[in-house]
Amino acid sequence: QVQVVTQDEREQLYTPASLKCSLQNAQEALIVTWQKKKAVSPENMVTFSENHGVVIQPAYKDKINITQLGLQNSTITFWNITLEDEGCYMCLFNTFGFGKISGTACLTVYVQPIVSLHYKFSEDHLNITCSATARPAPMVFWKVPRSGIENSTVTLSHPNGTTSVTSILHIKDPKNQVGKEVICQVLHLGTVTDFKQTVNKG
């Protein structure tokens, strides 16, 4: 049967993002409608037809436009994505002969990790703290010269949709660590980034 080809997209917060739908059909549609999927019922965003051109709903006036004006291939672009834009979007091709044929493309918003790495001596031990804030939640690992060093991790979700993961490395004999390199590894969206810290006796 006739189908619609879509592709999910993952884009960085406060950057543009585009979602595309392609009708796999010999003929163009009569009208294309883009809707945001909502819990109760989908919300109309924009339509494109030969009769009326592009019609953007008021709530989306300054947020989106149709950047590929086609009745077989249609692309909407968000000028500056926010966390509220994350979700799934339906493109509906109203075709002659086959009715409304829909596809779904999902948009995921990410925030690159902001990482801080510092250490603190206190009496007979050393705490090295690595904190990473990102969306989706990052993971924090340690690479240390020797094994058996304990660490504790705390995860905190923020109202802005980001998550902070803070890991503290507890070193009981700090003298052995002076001059040596400790690496905090942050894993985010399949990419591992190393953050290096050399411990100096303050």
Partner: antibody, heavy 117, light 107 residues
């Protein structure tokens, strides 16, 4: 020039099947939907269904309860409409037509199917 | 199914007359309506699509209007070759359905 040429008149007995062909020429067969419409004597036109020759996707009027099948042979640029379990009320002229979206421009000459015992 | 009701069912008019045929849908069909002309023993001929768009080669004396549920076909000045039966077709919702036809006869 564009032509849709339908097969000749048929006389069938109740319960039999009929297969009407519609041969297209003068254009790219897969670029246009082929639709089938019938008209019983003195009656209004009736949409039976249609096919997108590009993918072979078809859509039918449920009134025919699965009795109608529309197919195509792209190598022969021909569409077919088969109607099974014929009854007297299926006596009609059957037309094929082509459309680009909702733009109908060429029709076949019509095929009279008579169902009689 | 969406019901399409044409009026009048038949109409007598003279060459040069302005004629209007209406088609009413049982529910909103947007602008998804076509008009056809059919002469006895012949295949239908497309006149108008999407309520108001003229098919290539159709004389400009034919025009269509309307949206939603009420549609009109107008022939501005009847010519001898216009005497025929006219049908409307809705294609907003499947199954697509025709009106019962309006027979235009010579007065």
């Amino acid at each position: 020039q564009v032509q849709l040429v339908q097969s000749g008149a048929e006389v069938k007995k109740p319960g039999a099947s009929v297969k009407v062909s519609c041969k297209a020429s003068g254009y790219s067969f897969t670029d246009y939907i082929i639709l089938w419409v019938r008209q019983a004597p003195g009656q209004r036109l009736e949409w039976m269904g249609h096919i997108d020759p590009y993918y072979g996707s078809s859509n039918y009027n449920l009134k025919f309860k699965g009795r109608v099948t529309i197919t195509r042979d792209t190598s022969a640029s021909t569409a077919y409409m088969e109607l099974n379990s014929l009854r007297s009320e299926d006596t009609a002229v059957y037309y094929c037509a082509r459309s680009k979206r909702d733009y109908f421009d060429y029709w076949g000459q019509g095929t009279l199917v008579t169902v009689s015992s | 199914d969406i019901q399409m009701t044409q009026s009048p069912s038949s109409l007598s008019a003279s060459v040069g007359d302005r004629v209007t045929i209406t088609c009413k849908a049982s529910q909103d069909i947007n602008s998804y309506l076509s008009w056809f002309q059919q002469k006895p023993g012949k295949a239908p001929k497309s006149l108008i699509y999407r309520a108001n768009r003229l098919v290539d080669g159709v004389p400009s004396r034919f025009s269509g209007s309307g949206s939603g549920t009420d549609f009109t076909l107008t022939i501005s000045s009847l010519q001898p070759e216009d005497f025929a039966t006219y049908y409307c077709l809705q294609y907003d919702e499947f199954p697509y359905t025709f009106g019962q036809g309006t027979k235009l006869e010579i007065k």
